[in-house]
């Protein structure tokens, strides 16, 4: 006959490990007892349990309550045991010794491997601002046994660097993602992906990128100067810019205070029916926590009567 076992038994931390040991004997052979021991190199054998065909299971005090026989029905040639709630300290070599009649004794070894799944964490880097050089966007750390794999999933262009720290029974892996911040990255996801044999599926942590920027400011509304004439209603100037964080807008007049009746509504400056009083230089001031921008325009309110008079003069001059 011969013993059937596994070379390596792999179990996730906290789960139960089956330590297999099955005697494949010839017809009529019987198993008298099975002794299980831990036999790590350089250390003496430590008894786990003894399975006796007549007297049942005896578990050594060190493993009391943690070692069981399989539930019935049990094949009398099956010397497997169950190690409940595996911990990292259980990782190592185990041996089963089977006493059979009439064939004698057999022994087999297996290695128990306890996987410790990682609990990854993602830490965003310093605030990202447009114009910076290569900057840390985020770092992701995962510790487990064996060492986990840490990668990044993103559409954003960047570079990664990884480092590993080995501990006595595990390894911590940290991966950093660096990029050159640009406004196009705003709102883009940056996902840390952690793979490990103890995980049923990859663990993913997503960080949304925020890049501070402020676009150049411009003013819309003066495209057709001829519309800016005395008496016109609904005239307005709109300040155009964009930024992250969203900017605030402020309107001033360079050559004096804003005329009475002019309404400031965020990025928009609304005028009452136009008079020559509204002529002047207007400044839109755009700012956020990152930067500030100005844009100025000159409003020249036309007097239609003056214009027509001028035209007549010109005609008569010709």
């Amino acid at each position: 006959g011969e013993l059937e076992t596994s070379d390596v038994v792999t179990v996730v931390l906290g789960q139960d490990a089956k330590l297999p040991c099955f005697y494949r004997g010839d017809s009529g052979e019987q198993v008298g007892q099975v002794a299980w021991a831990r036999v790590d190199a350089g250390e003496g054998a430590q008894e786990l349990a003894l399975l006796h065909s007549k007297y049942g299971l005896h578990v050594s005090p060190a493993y009391e309550g943690r070692v069981e026989q399989p539930p019935p029905p049990r094949n009398p040639l099956d010397g497997s045991v169950l190690l409940r709630n595996a911990v990292q300290a259980d990782e190592g070599e185990y041996e089963c010794r089977v006493s059979t009649f009439p064939a004698g004794s057999f022994q087999a070894r297996l290695r128990l491997r306890v996987l410790v799944p990682p609990l990854p964490s993602l830490n965003p880097g310093p605030a990202l601002e447009e114009g910076q050089g290569l900057t840390l966007a985020a770092s992701c750390t995962a510790e487990g046994s064996p060492a986990p794999s840490v990668t990044w999933d993103t559409e954003v262009k960047g570079t990664t660097s990884s480092r590993s720290f080995k501990h006595s029974r595990s390894a911590a892996v940290t991966s950093e993602f660096h990029l050159v911040p640009s406004r196009s990255m705003n709102g883009q996801p940056l996902t840390c992906v952690v793979s490990h044999p103890g995980l049923l599926q990859d663990q993913r942590i997503t960080h949304i990128l925020h890049v501070s920027f402020l676009a150049e400011a411009s003013v819309r509304g003066l495209e057709d100067q001829n519309l800016w004439h005395i008496g016109r209603e609904g005239a307005m100037l709109k300040c155009l810019s964009e930024g992250q964080p969203p900017p605030s807008y402020n309107w001033t007049r360079l050559d004096g205070p804003l005329p009475s009746g002019v309404r400031v509504d965020g990025d928009t400056l609304g005028f009452p029916p136009l008079t020559t009083e509204h002529s002047g230089i207007y400044v839109c001031h755009v700012s956020n926590e990152f930067s500030s921008r100005d844009s100025q325009v000159t409003v020249d309110v036309l007097d239609p009567q003056e214009d027509s008079g001028k035209q007549v003069d010109l005609v008569s001059a010709s």
Epitope: T5, V9, K18, F22, R24, P71, P72, N75
Partner: antibody, heavy 123, light 107 residues
Framework: QVQLQQPGAELVMPGASVKMSCKAS????????MHWVKQRPGQGLEWIGA????????SYNQKFKGKATLTVDESSSTAYMQLSSLTSEDSAVYYC?????????WGYGMDNWGQGTSVTVSS | DIQMTQTTSSLSASLGDRVTISCRAS??????LNWYQQKPDGTVKLLIY???RLHSGVPSRFSGSGSGTDYSLTISNLEQEDIATYFC?????????FGGGTKLEIK
């Protein structure tokens, strides 16, 4: 995927015997035990016994010893149950069910069941 | 033999309800308690093994708990497809024995 195929029905005479089959596919037959369960019309489930398909070791419910005989044919991945000296009490649906006691797994529940064979004992 | 008792033979509930089915063993069964679902067409499936472990492919609305002699199966959010008979089974001592079953119906 794992499948256990059983014939739908068997009609047998009182006093006779019947041998029903359970053909396994989708897994390594000899890695798992095969259990047999009886269900009388409108009744609960009753465990008959089980066979270790790797070496034909059997374990029976005392109540069915002498009534049921469990065997396997490794070459066709088929488990069999023979019922002898049939009476009306043996009229029931008989299920075969796989039990996950393998080299690496622990046998807990019967994780795959056949559709059942309905046995009617009648003259 | 260990007797398994499911005191409620039939149970009526509404869709979306939380339903609990209990099972009692005549002696300690060391958590070797499994739950099976039998559909009206006779199909049998394993739901829960070793008291509380969800069999692969079984919806997470099914859960099991208990210890010693008292065990229960809970369906947290009853769906139409859960209409079936539920059996408990002990695997601690031979012969294996089953509860009488609890038939679940829709109100």
């Amino acid at each position: 995927q794992v499948q256990l195929q059983q014939p739908g029905a068997e009609l047998v005479m009182p006093g006779a015997s019947v041998k029903m089959s359970c053909k396994a596919s989708g897994y390594t037959f000899t890695d798992y035990w095969m259990h047999w369960v009886k269900q009388r019309p409108g009744q609960g489930l009753e465990w008959i016994g089980a066979i270790d398909t790797s070496d034909s070791y059997t374990s029976y419910n005392q109540k069915f010893k002498g009534k049921a005989t469990l065997t396997v044919d490794e070459s066709s991945s088929t488990a069999y149950m023979q019922l002898s000296s049939l009476t009306s009490e043996d009229s029931a649906v008989y299920y075969c069910a796989r039990w996950g006691s393998t080299m690496i797994t622990w046998g807990y529940g019967m994780d795959n069941w056949g559709q059942g064979t309905s046995v009617t004992v009648s003259s | 033999d260990i007797q398994m008792t499911q005191t409620t033979s039939s149970l009526s509930a509404s869709l979306g309800d939380r339903v609990t089915i209990s099972c009692r063993a005549s002696q300690d069964i060391n958590n070797y308690l499994n739950w099976y679902q039998q559909k009206p067409d006779g199909t049998v499936k394993l739901l829960i093994y070793y008291t509380s472990r969800l069999h692969s492919g079984v919806p997470s609305r099914f859960s099991g708990s208990g210890s010693g002699t008292d065990y229960s199966l809970t369906i947290s959010n009853l769906e139409q497809e859960d209409i079936a008979t539920y059996f408990c089974q002990q695997g601690n001592t031979l012969p294996w024995t089953f509860g009488g079953g609890t038939k679940l119906e829709i109100k």
